[in-house]
């Protein structure tokens, strides 16, 4: 056969669907690889062909669109399963072609089993809610296109294993779940089960997402440098190890890049000749506020090093701060027989 533009296996789109539920999978060609949509392609006389490779097999085979009750069907650029079966797992390929043009892409589809509490190997999206911030809501994801707007589905929400009536300041409102006030106790997995009729059959869609309650922008502050501070003086003798921690607290800020760095005499440690090492550790609070610690270490400090300026810097979307460490050379303790005796005028 003639050459086909093969985009390979698109592992970025690892599609996971639940067993025994409807699934609609759009051909990724039109979404991510080609500059035209299905309608344009169809109008130009191009045909969309589907085939698949079963799990642990190498053989590409056509998809059987003649199963009872049209269990698998194609509609425009969508491959439909009504419903899926566990052995539908495999790599699926959609190919767009005519006599002069060909383009194809493969993607993995995994049919996943869930238990009665909706636990499964499914990768869950995370939705962040601001703590004590007023009404916020989550929406049952990825249910568009499964039923027409004339169909009124029933939606049941669960937190973990339990059906949500109205509890813990949560109000179910159809496809939305409204949080009157988000608290740490609202952290967890939330599942919506959408039930709808189609051609005399009843289908269920199960969607689970993780809610994480995070710090509110109302409470966000610029970075706070806890160390170095004015109360601690790093007093060292030449030859000793100098260790200065820079500990910075960052309020949680959505999509903020938190940075901590040291300067020595106004330069980044990489730009000077001193043998400096910097180790960083990061910890998070329950609301994802962040504490970063960067420990500046000079194994054998020289008297020259003890005269330098060591400044810790921090930056977030809320602002930039800096604090100098108090570093000084330790004055050697007087040797009594010489210094002290001389002081008393002994000869």
């Amino acid at each position: 056969s003639e050459r086909c533009d093969d985009w390979g296996l698109d592992t970025m789109r690892q599609i996971q669907v639940f067993e025994d539920e409807p699934a609609r999978i759009k051909c990724p060609l039109f979404e991510h690889f080609l500059k035209f949509n299905y309608s344009t392609a169809h109008s130009a006389g191009l045909t969309l062909i589907w085939y698949w490779t079963r799990q642990d097999r190498d053989l590409e085979e056509p998809i059987n669109f003649r199963l009872p009750e049209n269990r698998i069907s194609k509609e425009k650029d969508v491959l439909w399963f009504r419903p899926t079966l566990l052995n539908d797992t495999g790599n699926y390929t959609c190919m767009l072609r005519n006599t002069t043009y060909c383009s194809k892409v493969a993607f993995p589809l995994e049919v996943v089993q869930k238990d009665s509490c909706f636990n499964s190997p499914m990768k869950l999206p995370v939705h962040k809610l601001y703590i004590e911030y007023g009404i916020q809501r989550i929406t049952c994801p990825n249910v568009d296109g499964y039923f027409p707007s004339s169909v009124k589905p029933t939606i049941t929400w669960y937190m973990g294993c339990y059906k949500i009536q109205n509890f813990n300041n949560v109000i179910p409102e159809g496809m939305n779940l409204s949080f009157l006030i988000a608290l740490i106790s609202n952290n967890g997995n939330y599942t919506c089960v959408v039930t709808y009729p189609e051609n005399g059959r009843t289908f269920h869609l199960t969607r689970t997402l993780t809610v994480k309650v995070v710090g509110s922008p109302k409470n966000a502050v610029p970075p706070v440098i806890h160390s170095p501070n004015d109360h601690v003086v790093y007093e060292k003798e030449p030859g000793e190890e100098l260790l200065i921690p820079c500990t910075v607290y960052f309020s949680f800020l959505m999509d903020s890049r938190n940075e901590v760095w040291w300067t020595i005499d106004g330069k980044k440690p990489d730009d000077i000749t001193i043998d400096v090492t910097i180790n960083e550790s990061i910890s998070h609070s329950r609301t994802e506020d962040e504490t970063r610690t960067q420990i500046l270490s000079i194994k054998k400090v020289t008297s020259e090093d003890l005269k330098r300026s060591y400044v810790c810097h921090a930056r977030s979307a809320k602002g930039e701060v800096a604090k100098a460490a108090k570093v000084k050379q330790k004055v050697p303790a007087p040797r009594y027989t010489v210094e002290l005796a001389c002081g008393f005028g002994a000869t």
């Epitope: 004590e132 007023g134 009404i135 809501r137 009536q165 109205n166 509890f167 813990n168 300041n169 949560v170 109000i171 179910p172 409102e173 159809g174 409204s178 009157l180 006030i181 608290l183």
Partner: antibody, heavy 126, light 111 residues
Framework: QQLEQSGGGAEGGLVKPGGSLELCCKA??????????ICWVRQAPGKGLEWIGC?????????YYASWVNGRFTLSRDIDQSTGCLQLNSLTAADTAMYYC??????????????WGPGTLVTVSS | ALVMTQTPSPVSAAVGGTVTINCQAS??????LAWFQQKPGQPPKLLIY???TLASGVPSRFSGSGSGTEFTLTISALQSDDAATYYC?????????????FGGGTEVVVK
């Protein structure tokens, strides 16, 4: 488990137009700090019920108000006293009503206003 | 804003009969609706919450149904003690606001 209301005295609160009054609602037989909201509802003489607002009675103290309140009324709570209060300001004759407080248990249902206080009559007149 | 419309008012029925009160929401409130009974000189009393759940201590003669925008309170085997005004309460959230709205009330007269 009940709510006791105070404010304006047993004979009810008589206030001049433009005046202010604080109504309070004390929990008896349960602690407000547990996880409850206190909601306030008023009823003008011979008329229906009108929602004023709700306050989360624990340390968070979040509040929601009906749009018509327009900042004239303020909800507060005193955790130690297990009390929720409603401050009424810039009162007019149209604010003459029986003012009720009611508990909402969000672990139960947010439309379940239960129990209710006995109500305090507020009369605004010169 | 959410508006709750109650019909009819007043409504009358004989002892032992059945009364149906309707409540219509101006927008979808799903199942977030309660029914209250109020007698003269008393505070309201919760009968039904979440559209159809009977509150503790309320006789099973009271039942609620509906979801979305149309709701019904039914009182069967009517007793003289059921003479009162009945209110529905709808709950709806919007962006950062809560909207609780009562219906105008329906007076039930027992003959």
């Amino acid at each position: 488990q009940q709510l006791e209301q105070s404010g304006g005295g047993a004979e009810g609160g008589l206030v001049k137009p433009g005046g202010s009054l604080e109504l309070c609602c004390k929990a008896s037989g349960f602690s407000l700090t547990t996880n409850y909201w206190i909601c306030w509802v008023r009823q003008a003489p011979g008329k229906g019920l009108e929602w004023i607002g709700c306050i989360y009675a624990n340390s968070v103290g979040s509040t929601y108000y009906a749009s018509w309140v327009n900042g004239r009324f303020t909800l507060s709570r005193d955790i130690d006293q297990s009390t929720g209060c409603l401050q009424l300001n810039s009162l007019t004759a149209a604010d003459t009503a029986m003012y009720y407080c009611a508990r909402v248990d969000p672990g139960y249902s947010f439309d379940a206003f239960d129990p209710w206080g006995p109500g305090t009559l507020v009369t605004v007149s010169s | 804003a959410l508006v709750m419309t109650q019909t009819p008012s007043p409504v009358s029925a004989a002892v032992g009969g059945t009364v149906t009160i309707n409540c219509q929401a101006s927008e979808d409130i799903y199942s977030n609706l309660a029914w209250f009974q109020q007698k003269p000189g008393q505070p309201p009393k919760l009968l039904i919450y979440r559209a159809s759940t009977l509150a503790s201590g309320v006789p099973s003669r009271f039942s609620g149904s509906g979801s979305g925008t149309e709701f019904t309170l039914t009182i069967s085997a009517l007793q003289s003690d059921d003479a009162a005004t009945y209110y529905c309460l709808g709950v709806r959230t919007y962006f950062n606001t809560l909207n609780n709205s009562f219906g105008g009330g329906t007076e039930v007269v027992v003959k």
